[in-house]
């Protein structure tokens, strides 16, 4: 007889998550050699260990910490690119701009990125089927925590100036309910952070508005002052532009407002 | 079976680009970073950069920067490295070159290698 | 950058003879250096990783030890098909470097 499988209404998890996983982790220490004493194999048996065999609606932080104590990196504190809404330019300047690190950047988020995964209460199997959706199901399921875990380790490390990457094109700039508004500015450390500022980057060509005027942006700051961290905005009008000056600094046309 | 093979020999008058190709089969190409290695006629090895295909993310050794651009179609499984600005220094052997899993970080598996001439 | 300085540049021997070729490093590279064979018109070919480990299907004659700064590539028994230039690679630090060779002749 089939045994019976809960259907959630999110997809399954990623096809060759293990690979994948175990993939990325031995890409990331050729990359970074700071990181060569990783081991990778534990790496993924701790990774595994956090959501197999468990409710994926019952995932707790807990269960991510012999991940997290493995994965332990430092990052320069005052170099920190957090984001929201616009993962791939917020990608593509730290591509450029080396010595600053979004979240996936790190070992750990580098790991997770864009993958899925879950598990099935009381068996070893990978649920490749389906697996909780934040909203319809649950929120305490293992990505949504894995998320959660990492990002609030990650602000929590910051200091000094930390740098926002927000989207203006959309209907909320800054979402409350984004992982940005509710795990990452909430835990930006005020006795070390010294100022949060926000690069809001347009989408339309001549889109010219002053979009640090946004209700949603004066919300944001709102929430930062009242944690005694200052607030600054910028408008990224052109984002080509933007990526191509900080390529080349020294280029004529980098010193006119981008 | 791991194997890489790269395209065949270029002649390039001073000033042009080549683009060298490295196609990859037997391994999931987005699991593995892919590297360059540049080789001068009866000379030594010097690595050139990587590419991460699977997220595009490159890196360039210091001395190729500004002429290499290293980029990787994940849609063929396959690497490119392209050099501007030829000069007849640049005549050599061009290698991609991989590591594997039971190997720490030295390359087990490499491409035949590209000849290119650079000559008027 | 990291420099590997390899030595001999070249050398020959009779075949049984051991043969040794040293590799320093110009800063710490802790156990990260390999051990590559080349012929002539060929690619590198793995031999020794992370200082003194034996790549899959490389024969026992080959070795290799040292850590830190000094390290040593030993050929036990010299044939007639290990006649080919030897490099040293650090792979601790970006960029990797290679050391400038040794060509193993036959006496």
């Known amino acids: 007889v089939p045994r019976w499988r809960q259907q959630w209404s999110g997809p399954g998890t990623t096809k060759r998550f293990p690979e994948t996983v175990l993939a990325r982790c031995v890409k990331y220490t050729e990359i970074h050699p700071e990181m060569r004493h990783v081991d990778c194999q534990s790496v993924w048996d701790a990774f595994k260990g956090a959501f197999i065999s468990k409710h994926p609606c019952n995932i707790t932080e807990e269960d991510y910490q012999p991940l997290m104590k493995l994965g332990t990196q430092t990052v320069p504190c005052n170099k920190i690119l957090l984001w929201s809404r616009i993962k791939d330019l917020a990608h593509q300047f730290t591509q450029v701009q080396r010595d600053m690190f979004t979240l996936e950047d790190t070992l750990l988020g580098y790991l997770a990125d864009d993958l899925t995964w879950c598990g099935e209460f009381n068996t070893s199997k990978i649920n490749y089927q389906s697996c909780p959706d934040w909203r319809k199901d649950c929120s305490n399921n293992p990505v949504s925590v894995f998320w959660k875990t990492v990002s609030r380790r990650f602000a929590e490390a910051a200091c000094d100036v930390v740098h926002v990457m927000l989207n203006g094109s959309r209907s909320k700039i800054f979402d409350k309910n984004s992982t940005f508004g509710s795990v990452e500015v909430h835990n930006l450390q005020p006795e070390k952070v010294q100022t949060l500022e926000a690069w809001v980057i347009h989408g339309g060509r001549e889109d010219s508005r002053d979009l640090c005027q946004d209700p949603t942006i004066k919300e944001l700051e709102s929430i930062i002052s009242k944690r005694n961290i200052q607030f600054s905005c910028k408008n990224i009008y052109r984002p080509d532009k933007f990526l191509q000056c900080v390529k080349n600094p020294e280029d004529s046309s980098c010193t006119s407002e981008i | 079976e791991v194997q890489l093979v790269q395209s065949g020999a270029e002649v390039k008058k001073p000033g042009a680009t080549v683009k060298i190709s490295c196609k990859v089969s037997?391994?999931?190409?987005?699991?593995?970073?892919m590297n360059w290695v540049q080789q001068h006629p009866g000379k030594g090895l010097e690595w050139m950069g990587w590419?991460?295909?699977?997220?595009?993310?490159?890196d360039v050794a210091e001395k190729f920067q500004g002429r290499v651009t290293i980029t990787a179609d994940t849609s063929t499984d396959t690497a490119y490295m392209e050099l501007s600005s030829l000069r007849s220094e640049d005549t050599a052997v061009y290698y991609c070159?991989?590591?594997?899993?039971?190997?720490?970080?030295?390359?087990?598996?490499w491409g035949q290698g590209t000849t290119v001439t650079v000559s008027s | 950058d990291i420099q590997m300085t390899q030595s001999p540049s070249s050398l020959s021997a009779s075949v049984g003879d051991r043969v040794t070729i040293t590799c320093k490093a110009s800063?710490?590279?802790?156990?990260?250096v390999d051990w590559y064979q080349q012929k002539p018109g060929k690619a590198p070919k793995l031999l020794i990783y992370?200082?003194?480990n034996r790549y899959t299907g490389v024969p026992s004659r080959f070795s290799g030890s040292g850590s830190g700064t000094d390290f040593t590539f030993t050929i036990s028994s010299l044939q007639p098909e290990d006649i080919a230039t030897y490099y040293c690679?650090?792979?601790?630090?970006?960029?990797?470097?290679f050391g400038g060779g040794t060509k193993v002749e036959i006496k």
């Open positions: 037997g391994y999931t190409f987005t699991d593995s970073v």
């Open positions: 690679m650090q792979s601790n630090t970006h960029p990797r470097t």
């Open positions: 800063q710490n590279v802790d156990s990260d």
């Open positions: 992370k200082a003194s």
């Open positions: 070159a991989r590591t594997g899993y039971q190997s720490g970080y030295g390359f087990p598996y």
């Open positions: 590419i991460d295909p699977e997220y595009g993310r490159t």
